[in-house]
């Protein structure tokens, strides 16, 4: 297993609809042809992994169908969307990079993106 | 070394606008969030509101909404804090910092007046 | 919005002695999200803990956080000259984010 850098951004504010997107960006040292990402969530000392995908360079990443992430690829780039997002669900993304094939095993894994998620102020009762 | 300057002081009448800049250097601007916090002469912090510069997104203090607007120029690498309709009590050092778990970059701060 | 209390207002030590500030929460924060800041007269806060008990870059080790849910501490095991000045808690766990009033630790 050899390692490899990934970037992300240091922090994202979800948007008011509970959406986050960023860029996961990894330093290809070779032609990988098949790649895995996943997202592990950090939170109170307790690591998650909230989705994971495996793409073949140059295809779309294919998560499962009731994943709450979805992304796309360009490069050495993902671009992952995670949806859904409460306020308990803030915490720290980390993005893990597989180059799995062809050999060797390269392995990645980011610093984190910490998510802000606020919660939409309640609408005030209306009489109409 | 990161670096975070903000503009310079300034006196407005109440009612008026004020816009205070802070331009980051040193670092991936859009990589983090700022963070802006008041304090009035003698008086304890008091924390406005933030934006993500990586996205825009912004979250404000209940009782500024509607008078605060956060921006940020990525061309520039500077944010902006908008405060309208000024009355007495806006008279405080406005900082800016940079964000992520607490704010562990400030600004100089910017003393804005407000006074008739 | 979370109320954030800092106790006591003031504090008088000596150089050399322990320091234990408190901030006390009106609900129940995520340890995660509870940071404390030292403040000097005409300048700007500097971010000391992060997350309750993280230290930030290059804050010495006699500065150390604690707590959970309503009550949190940062202690200063020896007082030194440049230690005394204003400390702030601020929580960002639930929006509104708040900060507390204040302690402020004076030589005796």
């Known amino acids: 297993c050899k390692a490899m850098h990934v970037a992300q951004p240091a922090v994202v504010l979800a948007s008011s609809r509970g959406i986050a997107s960023f860029v996961c960006e990894y330093a290809s040292p070779g032609k990988a042809t098949e790649v895995r990402v996943t997202v592990l969530r950090q939170a109170d000392s307790q690591v998650t992994e909230v989705c994971a995908a495996t793409y073949m360079m140059g295809n779309e990443l294919t998560f499962l169908d009731d994943s709450i992430c979805t992304g796309t690829s360009s490069g050495n780039q993902v671009n992952l969307t995670i949806q859904g997002l409460r306020a308990m669900d803030t915490g720290l993304y980390i993005c893990k990079v597989e180059l799995m094939y062809p050999p060797p095993y390269y392995l990645g894994i980011g610093n984190g993106t910490q998510i802000y998620v606020i919660d939409p102020e309640p609408c005030p009762d209306s009489d109409f | 070394q990161v670096q975070l300057v903000q503009s310079g002081a300034e006196v407005k009448k109440p009612g008026a606008s004020v816009k205070v800049s802070c331009k980051a250097s040193g670092y991936t601007f859009t990589s983090y969030g700022i963070s802006w916090v008041r304090q009035a002469p003698g008086q304890g912090l008091e924390w406005m509101g933030w934006?993500?510069?990586?996205?825009?997104?912004?979250n404000y203090a209940q009782k500024l909404q509607g008078r605060v607007t956060m921006t940020t120029d990525t061309s520039t690498s500077t944010a902006y804090m908008e405060l309208r309709s000024l009355r007495s009590d806006d008279t405080a050092v406005y900082y800016c910092?940079?964000?992520?778990?607490?704010?562990?970059?400030w600004g100089q701060g910017t003393l804005v007046t407000v006074s008739s | 919005e979370i109320v954030l209390t800092q106790s006591p207002g003031t504090l008088s030590l000596s150089p050399g002695e322990r320091a234990t500030l408190s901030c006390r929460a009106s609900?129940?924060?995520?340890?995660?999200?509870l940071a404390w800041y030292q403040q000097k007269p005409g300048q700007a806060p500097r971010l000391l803990i992060y997350?309750?008990?993280s230290r930030a870059t290059g804050i010495p080790d006699r500065f150390s956080g604690s707590g959970s849910g309503t009550d949190f501490t940062l202690t200063i095991s020896r007082l030194e000259p440049e230690d005394f000045a204003v400390y702030h808690c601020?929580?960002?766990?639930?929006?509104?984010?708040?900060l507390g009033q204040g302690t402020k630790v004076e030589i005796k």
């Open positions: 997350g309750a008990s």
């Open positions: 601020q929580q960002y766990g639930r929006s509104p984010w708040t």
């Open positions: 934006i993500s510069a990586y996205n825009g997104n912004t």
């Open positions: 609900q129940s924060v995520s340890s995660s999200y």
């Open positions: 910092g940079r964000w992520v778990r607490g704010v562990e970059y």
